[in-house]
């Protein structure tokens, strides 16, 4: 707490300027009112406080505002933002997405904070669903942040949406989570034509049932390896050796050194002999 | 990308004068703090300048006040560091590096030595 | 000026230690700190700030932790690529100072 002292004659803050980064502590809470601090918020981050008086500035707006600050103060935080705990955060009501934007650049560069967090969860939970402008926000600056919701969550996600993911932002969801995306990703690009919605939907196919994967192995899309290694063991099993043969194209040959690896290894003692040795790669069910 | 690229480092006197520039790319100077900070041979980090362009705000170490000063040509993405009465103890690696608070870029450094 | 001091100047380990690195400040500077790593003739690289966040890129053995004016750097499983000096800095008031760094050697 900073004690409260009288402002020195002279020295009463008119305006938000670069004069106040040579305010003491003391000097900086008697001297700048806080109605005139949360009127010219714009301007303070384009003024160098030292980290000291930012501790300042916010135990003001803290006391102007003790239900929350409203939102044309927090769209001005900027490195403001990095001295609020997520229990502050909570009391706040976000709605613009340029706010949201603005206190992300803050952060941009770390992985997420619980302040961060705690941001993102009042946002989403204002708007109800998670909107296409909000993922392509949110998954530009966090590409993991997909994979960083639940199951239920992700289920609100409109499947209009899923045309903001971008394939990395998938590398970090499990099977669980993929489940819940693929659905909404094959409603989303039903209406590409085959190679096409094959480059499109490949980063979901973790969450592929085996009629679908089926389907795909008339479709000459040859999947690499790479996918083929995350699909479900149990999409994977019902599938034959032709379907697979298909399904991978010139990639099929990858088969043999991933042949101790799941999906592989299981599809393999599910085959039969004969039928694997028509690929010609020495796979032993 | 973000790079930054310093220039400007020598041999020079005891009393001498250089102009170090620290070039700026893949972001603009004007949204960012630009700080020098300086090594001697075998010694740890010590910050010497600060700028704020928005403002033109700067603030010095203590060790170089009066005889160094920091400013940037917005136009040309560049910060500089104009030293003057240069002294055996400024020698030392320069490195120009960006940010607020802590330095998330740095320069590769120019070497000035100061001796006669 | 706020002082901070590091702890130790220097130390010997293996790969695979675990390695704890301290700085402390002369005078309170909340989470107003930063670490940063530097390897022989290049130039220092931004581990962690604000006390514990990391930054991006960065392995996640790096942790930083501390409040007030005590600070600890740990890196949790020591790999041959982490020797080098490591400094802590003070961004809390003007002047930003450094620590005097800590040399981690191979044992």
């Known amino acids: 707490e900073v004690e409260k002292t009288a402002c020195p004659s002279g020295k009463k803050a008119r305006e938000i300027d670069e004069s106040l980064i040579f305010y003491k502590k003391w000097e900086l809470e008697a001297c700048v009112d806080a109605a005139l601090l949360a009127t010219q918020m714009d301007r303070v981050n384009a003024i160098p406080f030292t980290y000291e008086q930012l501790d300042v500035l916010k135990h003001k707006l803290d006391e102007l505002y003790p239900q929350g600050y409203p939102e044309s103060v927090i769209q001005h935080l900027g490195y403001l933002f990095l001295k609020m705990s997520p229990e502050d955060i909570r009391k706040w009501n976000v709605t613009s997405l340029e706010t949201l934007k603005a206190l992300l650049e803050v952060n941009k560069g770390h992985e997420m904070s619980p302040q961060v967090a705690t941001l993102i969860d009042r946002f989403v939970k204002g708007r109800g669903q998670l909107d296409k402008d909000t993922l392509d926000t949110l998954t530009a600056f966090y590409p993991g942040y997909l994979c960083s919701l639940s199951p239920e969550e992700l289920s609100s996600v409109p499947p209009s949406s899923i045309w903001a993911v971008r394939p990395q932002d998938l590398d970090t969801c499990d099977p669980r989570q993929l489940d819940v995306l693929y659905p909404k990703a094959r409603l989303a690009f039903q209406n590409m034509n085959g190679s096409e919605y094959f480059v499109k939907i490949q980063s979901f196919l973790g969450g592929a049932p085996t009629e679908d994967l089926k389907a795909l192995s008339q479709q000459n899309v040859s999947m690499d390896l790479a996918t083929f290694m995350k699909l479900r063991t149990d999409a994977v099993l019902p599938l034959t050796v032709a379907e697979v043969q298909k399904l991978l194209g010139p990639h099929v040959e990858g088969l043999k050194a991933e042949e101790r690896h799941r999906p592989v290894r299981d599809w393999i003692l599910r085959q039969r002999q004969d039928d694997l040795d028509t690929l010609g790669l020495g796979l032993q069910g | 990308e973000v790079q930054l690229v310093e220039s400007g480092g020598g041999l020079v006197q005891p009393g001498g004068s250089l102009r170090l520039s620290c070039a700026a790319s893949?972001?603009?100077?004007?949204?960012?703090?630009i700080h020098w900070v300086r090594q001697a041979p075998g010694k740890g980090l010590e910050w010497v300048a600060s700028?704020?362009?928005?403002?033109?705000?700067?603030t010095y170490a203590d060790s170089v006040k009066g005889r160094f000063t920091i400013s940037a040509d917005t136009s040309k993405n560049t910060a500089y560091l104009q030293m003057n009465s240069l002294r055996a103890e400024d020698t030392a690696v320069y490195y120009c590096?960006?940010?607020?608070?802590?330095?998330?870029?740095w320069g590769q450094g120019t070497l000035v030595t100061v001796s006669s | 000026d706020i002082q901070m001091t590091q702890s130790p100047s220097s130390l010997s380990a293996s790969v695979g230690d675990r390695v704890t690195i301290t700085c402390r400040a002369s005078?309170?500077?909340?989470?107003?700190v930063a670490w940063y790593q530097q390897k022989p003739g290049k130039a220092p690289k931004l581990l962690i700030d604000?006390?514990?966040r990391l930054y991006s890129g960065v392995p996640s053995r790096f942790s930083g932790s501390g409040s007030g004016t005590d600070f600890t750097l740990t890196i949790s499983s020591l790999q041959p690529e982490d020797f080098a000096t490591y400094y802590c800095?003070?961004?809390?008031?003007?002047?930003?100072?450094f620590g005097q760094g800590t040399k981690v050697e191979i044992k």
């Open positions: 590096a960006r940010g607020r608070y802590w330095m998330d870029y």
């Open positions: 893949g972001f603009t100077i004007t949204d960012r703090t």
């Open positions: 700028i704020f362009p928005t403002k033109g705000v700067t």
């Open positions: 005078q309170d500077v909340k989470e107003g």
């Open positions: 604000q006390s514990h």
């Open positions: 800095q003070q961004y809390y008031a003007w002047p930003s100072t």
